[in-house]
């Protein structure tokens, strides 16, 4: 008796954060025997789309000529062989960034700061939000949400780092976003430079030491500690 | 009861245009694709092609990509074809037929069909 | 594409009797293949998919049976409500009909 169909590896070209208005393309991969392709999303009848594969017949794709918040949301895809339907792919999360109107972001007190000191930056939106997100770029795990307790709205987000090294060094982006939600995000904030000083090349901080690290040239995710004052936001991992 | 209601027989022109109907009742619309199939006198069926409900998503058969268009109205949980070029290879009967949810079969549920002749 | 060929075009029945119709596919279809009952002015209804999975409420002396390239449906103890036309599906790779079988009394 043989296993379960392999499951398909499903992604999104040009990546799975697309601004309001841009196209995108979804692809499926499976086997050589694959007869259909199917996507589904998450709280959609299935199947939200389906397709026949593209020759040699291991792939199928999905379009969307132009995003909107309809199409953000989180998808899987299967496809079928002669002996029947494919184990679901692993998750995409599609998300659209230009729901909202830009947040700002800044370091308080400077962006330009000395390793071993600590910075906080301040994200803020000109209408209340639920949760803010906190980006860096050229990192592969980039997202670090702080959400509110209980869905309170909050007009900002603090992210203290501390102590900064070497590693937090880098540009910065932010966004906000509603809770009802995850899949919807703001325009992205203005860049952020933040720029580390000393003399001496920092040792990166090891996971277990109770600090904060951004993402920096091996694309360690953003791992945040500590309180956030000010904000009624909790740390929230995705 | 899962009910497709097609609209009337149509007579055209050649080279005009026609919008066929099909009315669902007894499920929700928006959970199943609706497909469209063409049957010629004397001939087998086609299948032109299908269209998902609940986001307008549609496939088409190669064939019938330039001559049919698929929509739908979910406010009144109708599906429509649009034939247009119309020629005389265009008179046939075309039923509209529901997809399966599962998709381990296409068409659980067909139309009566609609008879569209076009003659000059 | 996968062409379908339906044998025979038509058949005469008589009442109490079986009747057995075939589909022959192109290439293998792997058991997905659906037969359809179609009287003059309705619609199409379902009789079996997968080969031989009858659907809900249709009665039991209508069967399917097949693998390969090589289906048949056959229906036995004909009563008179089965004057029909009757089609085959395949729908491992793409959809294509059969050209269908009259049944005649």
């Known amino acids: 008796q043989a296993g379960p169909l392999p499951k398909p590896t499903l992604w999104a070209e040009p990546g799975s954060v697309i601004s309001w208005g841009n196209s995108v393309t979804i692809w499926c991969q499976g086997t050589l025997e694959a007869r259909e392709y199917r996507l589904d999303k998450e709280e959609s009848p299935a199947p939200w789309d389906r397709q026949n594969p593209l020759e040699p017949k291991n792939k199928a794709r999905f379009s969307i000529p132009s995003m909107t918040e309809d199409y953000a949301g989180r998808y899987r895809c299967y496809y079928r062989s002669p002996v029947g339907w494919s184990q679901p792919s692993d998750p995409l999360e599609l998300v659209m960034t230009g729901a909202y109107s830009k947040p700002t972001l800044s370091a308080l007190p400077s962006p330009l700061v000395t390793s071993g000191k600590s910075v906080t930056l301040l994200c803020q939106s000109r209408s209340p939000m639920d949760t803010f997100l906190l980006i860096k770029e050229r990192a592969a795990h980039p997202l670090l949400h702080l959400r509110s307790e209980h869905g309170a709205q909050q007009h900002q987000a603090e992210f203290p780092m501390s102590p900064v090294t070497s590693v937090h060094g880098g540009t910065y982006r932010c966004f906000s976003s509603h809770g009802f939600s995850h899949y919807l995000l703001s325009h992205p904030s203005d860049p952020l430079e933040l720029i580390v000083s000393g003399s001496l090349e920092d040792p990166r901080p090891s996971p277990t030491r109770s600090v904060s690290t951004a993402a920096g040239p091996e694309d360690q995710p953003l791992m945040p500690t500590g309180s956030v004052p000010h904000s009624g936001l909790r740390r929230h991992w995705e | 009861e899962v009910q497709l209601q097609q609209s009337g027989a149509e007579l055209v022109k050649p080279g005009a245009s026609v919008k066929l109907s099909c009315k669902a009742s007894g499920y929700t619309f928006t959970n199943y694709w609706m497909h469209w199939v063409k049957q010629r006198p004397g001939q087998g069926l086609e299948w032109i092609g299908e269209?998902?409900?609940?986001?307008?998503?549609?496939n088409y058969n190669e064939k019938f990509k330039s001559k049919a268009t698929l929509t739908v109205d979910k406010s009144s949980s109708t599906a429509y074809m649009q034939l247009s070029s119309l020629t005389s290879e265009d008179s046939a009967v075309y039923y509209c037929?529901?997809?399966?949810?599962?998709?381990?079969?296409?068409?659980?549920?067909w139309g009566q069909g609609t008879t569209l002749t076009v003659s000059s | 594409d996968i062409q379908m060929t339906q044998t025979p075009s038509s058949l005469s029945a008589s009442l109490g009797g079986k009747v057995t119709i075939t589909c022959k596919a192109s290439q293998d279809i792997n058991n997905y293949i659906a037969w359809y009952q179609h009287k003059p002015g309705k619609g199409p209804r379902l009789l079996i998919h997968?080969?031989?999975t009858l659907q809900p409420g249709i009665p039991s002396r209508f069967s399917g049976s097949g693998s390969g390239r090589d289906y048949s449906f056959s229906i036995s103890n004909l009563e008179p409500e089965d004057i029909a036309t009757y089609f085959c599906l395949q729908y491992d790779i793409l959809l294509t009909f059969g050209g269908g079988t009259k049944l005649e009394k």
């Open positions: 997968y080969t031989s």
């Open positions: 269209i998902n409900p609940s986001n307008g998503r549609t």
């Open positions: 037929a529901r997809g399966s949810l599962t998709t381990v079969v296409p068409f659980d549920y």
